[in-house]
Interface confidence: medium
């Protein structure tokens, strides 16, 4: 039984298509965005000194009640090999520095798509 | 909105330096390449230097290799560039500028502050 179709394939899924499917979501936002994404909710802008991915769920983490960001927080979770909860405050962030949740989608977006472009899948 | 402010601009002697500023907001700086440009008196837009996110690779204009620094300081939404030797002909109007991540162009750009070389 080569063939499972519907079927999500066993063991890990490859860190290029999380990648991938990461982009697919933060586009959806981006483009079915027709009020202010979570309400113009500000988020933390970040460093990438102790990792992106982290970095970007720390941030957005803190963005509560808004359904449209909920998946993109379960799939960075994926990729953030620690444990995050709302109200950390670490050096990832940089500090007084705010900027509107669809900005930081944006430029995640933008960034991420540079990786998978030049094959950086981790 | 995105806004680029470029500081540390003057007058300096031939052989001196000069350490340029350019504090960035309304973006997530860190996630940007950002370069510095530079405009001559009567001349076209003359690229200076690149760098990369987490400040690695860098690159430079083979005219200020050796002489110039560029680095970032993602804590504080900052970019510099410093610079030593300055020659005569570095003299130039100095601009910030944030590389698009997938079109690999500028997209926005400083006010630019003046830097003049001169005895």
């Known amino acids: 039984l080569t063939c499972l179709g519907g079927f999500a394939s066993p063991g890990p899924v490859p860190p290029s298509t999380a990648l991938r499917e990461l982009i697919e979501e933060l586009v959806n936002i981006t483009q079915n965005q027709k009020a202010p994404l979570c309400n113009g909710s500000m988020v933390w802008s970040i460093n990438l000194t102790a990792g992106m991915y982290c970095a970007a769920l720390e941030s957005l983490i803190n963005v509560s009640g808004c359904s449209a960001i909920e998946k993109t927080q379960r799939m960075l979770s994926g990729f953030c090999p620690h444990k995050v909860s709302a109200g950390q405050f670490s050096s990832l962030h940089v500090r007084d520095t705010k900027i509107e949740v669809a900005q930081f989608v944006k430029d995640l977006l933008l960034h991420l798509k540079k990786l998978f472009r030049e094959g950086q899948f981790n | 909105e995105v806004q680029l402010l470029e500081s540390g601009g003057g007058l300096v002697q031939p052989g001196g330096s000069l350490r340029l500023s350019c504090a960035a907001s309304?973006?997530?700086?860190?996630?940007?390449?950002m370069s510095w440009v530079r405009q001559a008196p009567g001349k076209g837009l003359e690229w200076v230097s690149t760098?990369?996110?987490?400040?690695?690779?860098?690159y430079y204009a083979d005219s200020v290799k050796g002489r110039f620094t560029i680095s970032r300081d993602d804590s504080k939404n900052t970019l510099y560039l410093q610079m030593n030797s300055l020659r005569a002909e570095d003299t130039a109007v100095y601009y910030c500028?944030?590389?698009?991540?997938?079109?690999?162009?500028?997209?926005?750009w400083g006010q630019g502050t003046l830097v003049t070389v001169s005895s």
């Open positions: 500028a944030k590389v698009h991540s997938v079109e690999n162009e500028f997209d926005y």
């Open positions: 309304g973006f997530t700086f860190a996630l940007y390449d």
């Open positions: 760098i990369t996110p987490l400040g690695s690779p860098t």
